[in-house]
């Protein structure tokens, strides 16, 4: 059966990097410039991905594999195979419909991507706020008030760098 199939379909002999050219009696022709075939037996070659604008070339296209892109500095990849490039924001910000905006009071973002998240609510775990939250940093929860024995000196939190706030209760 395999022998019969290969006799019926000469295209199965065409290796990656070529295509089965119907216009030339089904002989294997090399992929034209800026195209590739990653598997054998293909009747067409695929157009190479072009990395333009905010996309930059991480790996050039070859006759057997597609180009790979990453993002120019100041942007980061999203999606499989870096299908999107998204602008970085500063820590303490998130990307909104109108661009990078500061995190609202009570939220923080410690990365250049992603969304602002609410500060941890220490009281839910029966703990107290040891270090206040900022736009860039979550609150630090300390021991519960009951854990501090009478007369024991409590820890004095360092002055926060920017916009001190308290964990939402």
């Amino acid at each position: 059966f395999e022998r019969t199939r290969s006799l019926q379909d000469p295209c199965s002999n065409c290796p990656a990097g070529t295509f089965c050219d119907n216009n030339r009696n089904q002989i294997c022709s090399p992929c034209p410039p800026n195209s590739f075939s990653s598997a054998g037996g293909q009747r067409t070659c695929d157009i190479c991905r072009q990395c333009k604008g905010v996309f930059r070339t991480r790996k050039e296209c070859s006759s057997t594999s597609n180009a790979e892109c990453d993002c120019t500095p100041g942007f980061h990849c999203l999606g499989a195979g870096c299908s999107m490039c998204e602008q970085d924001c500063k820590q303490g910000q998130e990307l909104t419909k109108k661009g990078c905006k500061d995190c609202c009071f009570g939220t923080f973002n410690d990365q250049k991507r992603g969304i602002c998240r609410p500060w941890t609510n220490c009281s839910l775990d029966g703990k107290s706020v040891l270090v206040n939250g900022t736009k860039e940093r979550d609150v630090v929860c300390g021991p519960s008030p009951a854990d501090l024995s009478p007369g024991a000196s409590s820890v004095t939190p360092p002055a926060p760098a920017r916009e001190p706030g308290h964990s939402p209760q």
Epitope: F55, G81, M84, C85, E86, Q87, T96, K97, K98, G99
Partner: nanobody, 122 residues
Framework: EVQLVESGGGLVQPGGSLRLSCAAS????????MSWARQVPGKGFEWVAY???????YYADSVKGRFTISRDNAKDTVYLHMNSLKFEDMAVYYC????????????????WGQGTQVTVSS
Amino acid sequence: EVQLVESGGGLVQPGGSLRLSCAASGFTFSSSAMSWARQVPGKGFEWVAYIYSDGSTYYADSVKGRFTISRDNAKDTVYLHMNSLKFEDMAVYYCATWRSQQVGRWDEYDHWGQGTQVTVSS
């Protein structure tokens, strides 16, 4: 084949004005959101302005009040009117389609022009 061809760049003094044009072909321009971005050598890209198919617009804070993006669907052209130009506006300006319609984000199927240089010098 999709093509975006920018023109209108050049040398201008601080405080001067320029109008960049981007002629589009090979796709349905009237239903496509479009964008302008710029690249300062050694400083990377930044988005400048966006315009939806319905004509609504977004601007980067750095150009708000000085730059205006507009479109002429009859001519398949998008424009960037730049007034009160500053030294920091000097860059290569690119026109691009904007499929994601999220400010600061482009996807792999967006198309980009070749860019036009804007030089601000006294």
